[in-house]
Interface confidence: medium
Amino acid sequence: AGSDSLYVPCAPSPCVNGGTCRQTGDFTFECNCLPGFEGSTCERNIDDCPNHRCQNGGVCVDGVNTYNCRCPPQWTGQFCTEDVDECLLQPNACQNGGTCANRNGGYGCVCVNGWSGDDCSENIDDCAFASCTPGSTCIDRVASFSCMCPEGKAGLLCHLDDACISNPCHKGALCDTNPLNGQYICTCPQGYKGADCTEDVDEGNSHHHHHH
């Protein structure tokens, strides 16, 4: 204000942010600030975060005469104290038939046989624990495995000698190996019977299976 003009401390009001001006002397004033503000003209926001109650990793965000908690994804509520039920929010959180189990600050999956990982998306490598005989090839399946045998070997684990190698089945019969005991099984053509299909049979009988 110039020397020739009349200075009135509260006209216009120097108080900001809704503060009210009170003249305290000929040239002095005082601002009464609204909650959440301070300063000689109420210009400064009071930081409400120093005594915040945000929990579980929540970050305090100052407001005007208040604060909010920015919660990590696993928590919710005013102070991040309420657990988020991920099983409700994400119905497909667990894959391949796994069962979702909500926990404080997270969730877990109970996987069905053959699957593992946080969301049951990883097929367990059953070959890692398989006992296929050396020289055979292990094929991983869901909750199981199979052994692909080299020539001359048979059985679930390729641990048996293949009885069909010696061509025990006669007369063009089909030879199969019993995977449990390694013995040969001859499927005889029409008109033959016996363990190795060497016997003639009466007419009217069809194919015969013989185990040995």
Epitope: T28, E38, G39, R44, N45, D47, D62
Partner: antibody, heavy 120, light 107 residues
Framework: EVQLVESGGGLVQPGGSLKLSCAVS????????MEWIRQASGKGLEWIAA??????????VYSASVKDRFTISRDTSKSTLYLQMNSLKTEDTAVYYC???????????WGQGTLVTVSS | DIQMTQSPSSVSASVGDRVTITCQTS??????LAWYQQKPGKSPKLLIY???RLQDGVPSRFSGSGSGTDYTLTISSLQPEDFATYFC?????????FGGGTKVEIK
Amino acid sequence: EVQLVESGGGLVQPGGSLKLSCAVSGFTFSDFYMEWIRQASGKGLEWIAAQRNKANDFSIVYSASVKDRFTISRDTSKSTLYLQMNSLKTEDTAVYYCSRDGGKWGLDAWGQGTLVTVSS
Amino acid sequence: DIQMTQSPSSVSASVGDRVTITCQTSEDIYSGLAWYQQKPGKSPKLLIYGASRLQDGVPSRFSGSGSGTDYTLTISSLQPEDFATYFCQQGFKYPLTFGGGTKVEIK
């Protein structure tokens, strides 16, 4: 005319104490927030302490770097602002300024500064 | 605490040039920003307060603008006495924080 004049700086050993003064004139001292700011040689400005005005009960706020070591106060009868500095560290070496917070987000008057050197 | 990012850290300019300095804050400070000029061995001098209001006695070639988190100090036509270091400062909440400074040098 608004004036602020600091004094009390000097050389002090680590762990020692020093009290800075800032004599003010030209305005109603009790109506204003007062601040202490420091500046290490060739560096930026760092706010360290404030004392609010009479309307706000002369309450105090400190920066984390000096809390529990420095104390700001004022004597209105002497129109002087003080900064008592205890447990001084080498990193407290700086020029210390007192300033008047004019409201409206600006520090509108500054002293000339006083140099504090903490060294053994 | 509110972080202040001031750029550039230095600028070389000639008399008559237009110089722009920016200051970015880590959160909205609702125009609660001041700009200061400091010359070697001297104390800072308030130029702009409230982001855009010119302090009494400061030449009109200095101007401030901005809102939210982005603020600018502009010197429209650089004068010899303007070669100095400039600082921004937020006064929106304690602790008060300053930008790192911009040194305006002669090209």
